[in-house]
Interface confidence: low
Amino acid sequence: EPHSLRYNLTVLSWDGSVQSGFLAEVHLDGQPFLRYDRQKCRAKPQGQWAEDVLGNKTWDRETRDLTGNGKDLRMTLAHIKDQKEGLHSLQEIRVCEIHEDNSTRSSQHFYYDGELFLSQNLETEEWTVPQSSRAQTLAMNVRNFLKEDAMKTKTHYHAMHADCLQELRRYLESGVVLRRTVPPMVNVTRSEASEGNITVTCRASSFYPRNIILTWRQDGVSLSHDTQQWGDVLPDGNGTYQTWVATRICRGEEQRFTCYMEHSGNHSTHPVPSGKVLVLQSHW
């Protein structure tokens, strides 16, 4: 997977009046990395991992950048000539990527009330607008405003692309992102299902990177896909991920089943606990 930096900013308006402040989150390689704390008006690292990336430096630069981006987005929302009643949101997602072959990609996406209405490739400056008439109207409003704003010139878009990549490279230089491998903690639990059946659940948590294989095996052979239920692989807020897989088995056959986990070249198997012991928890 490519290395990526993703900015997610949202501003709100109430009856046409743009609210002060904004919401902002930054993801590094798909992990929550920074957020803007509205009460303290500061960019803050999301967990110890994020702090490690920049060492003991202050987050003044990130605070300044996010504040500037938030101000720009508030001005953009003020120029949207849409229905003014009620609560509305304008969201901007900006992503830049560095691929294994060192090629780069950058894009910017705008959402109004959660609906995508405008995208731009920041390298080619090509705009894309969905077909709906609402999206077309919104996109026209925003593009006209961006054209009017002297800052939103070709130079500005190239700068946005370059700045994002520069920040991404700066974070990657710490080495924390590149070398990090955190093995999962694996829990196996059982719960009563219908008569004669039990549901067994295998949970993997606190692992990085995101890629993991988690599956139930019977007598050493993986169960078919349709007999298992998988959870999404989700960030857990600590710079690591969590997921789970569950299946239903006959009571009394627990010893035939194991949870198989494979992560970053390592693998392990985890048995179903007996009825007396509810949870088996292990790091491999």
Partner: antibody
């Protein structure tokens, strides 16, 4: 101390009306949008209505639209909810809560409304 | 209206356990999500705002993450006072909506 205190809850028959009040203190009431949120016995939270800080605009959940009216008197630091054509399903604890528009970090203690024949 | 679906609906856990509750929105809501704790007969208490910001006075064992449609509330080490019902709430657009709640019980 920041506070919201609801009053006016009662037992009423279906089809009748009731007015709830919410008195605010400890913060600048006229700067905040205020919401009503309700919770039926043993059930989850349900947003009911919101009124803008200056009282100009009001928004309602579909379940109460056309029956309930939210209003405020900034000179008295008080929020109101006029509930008409009450139904059994309106039985709930009614909370006023503040969020401009935001997470509700100020809640009243709630007032119970029971609609029963 | 934006629908919020919490999972699980109920959960049994022990003191010291790490617990995760998820909230999924029917459409993207950016970071406009809050989490509340409610104990029986008590008023809801705000824990997290803007998806991941800890409300003042809330213990650091509570954390929130996610943006867009998928959100999580994590309690890193359960304490006896944490057994309660937890709700997520979106304030991205009207009508404001809440998840159906997750009841956290002592195992």
């Amino acid at each position: 101390q920041v506070q919201l205190v609801e009053s006016g809850g009662d037992v009423v028959q279906p089809g009748r009306s009731l007015r709830l009040s919410c008195a605010a203190s400890g913060f600048t009431f006229s700067n905040y949008n205020i919401h009503w949120v309700r919770q039926a016995p043993g059930k989850g939270l349900e947003w009911v209505a919101v009124i803008r800080y200056d009282g100009i605009n009001k928004y309602y959940a579909d379940s109460v639209k056309g029956r309930f009216i939210i209003s405020r008197d900034n000179s008295k630091n008080t929020l109101y909810l006029q509930m008409n054509s009450l139904r059994a399903e309106d039985t709930a604890v009614y909370y006023c809560a503040s969020g401009p528009p935001d997470a509700f970090n100020i809640w009243g203690q709630g007032t119970m409304v029971t609609v029963s024949s | 209206a934006i629908q919020l679906t919490q999972s699980p609906s109920s959960l049994s856990a022990s003191v010291g356990d790490r617990v995760t509750i998820t909230c999924r929105a029917s459409q993207g809501i950016s970071s406009a999500l809050a989490w509340y704790q409610q104990k029986p007969g008590k008023v809801p208490k705000s824990l997290i705002y803007d998806a991941s910001s800890l409300e003042s006075g809330v213990p650091s064992r509570f954390s929130g993450s996610g943006s867009g449609t998928d959100f999580t509330l994590t309690i890193s080490s359960l304490q006896p006072e944490d057994f309660a019902t937890y709700y997520c709430q979106q304030f991205n657009s009207y009508p404001i909506t809440f998840g159906q709640g997750t009841r956290l019980e002592i195992k």
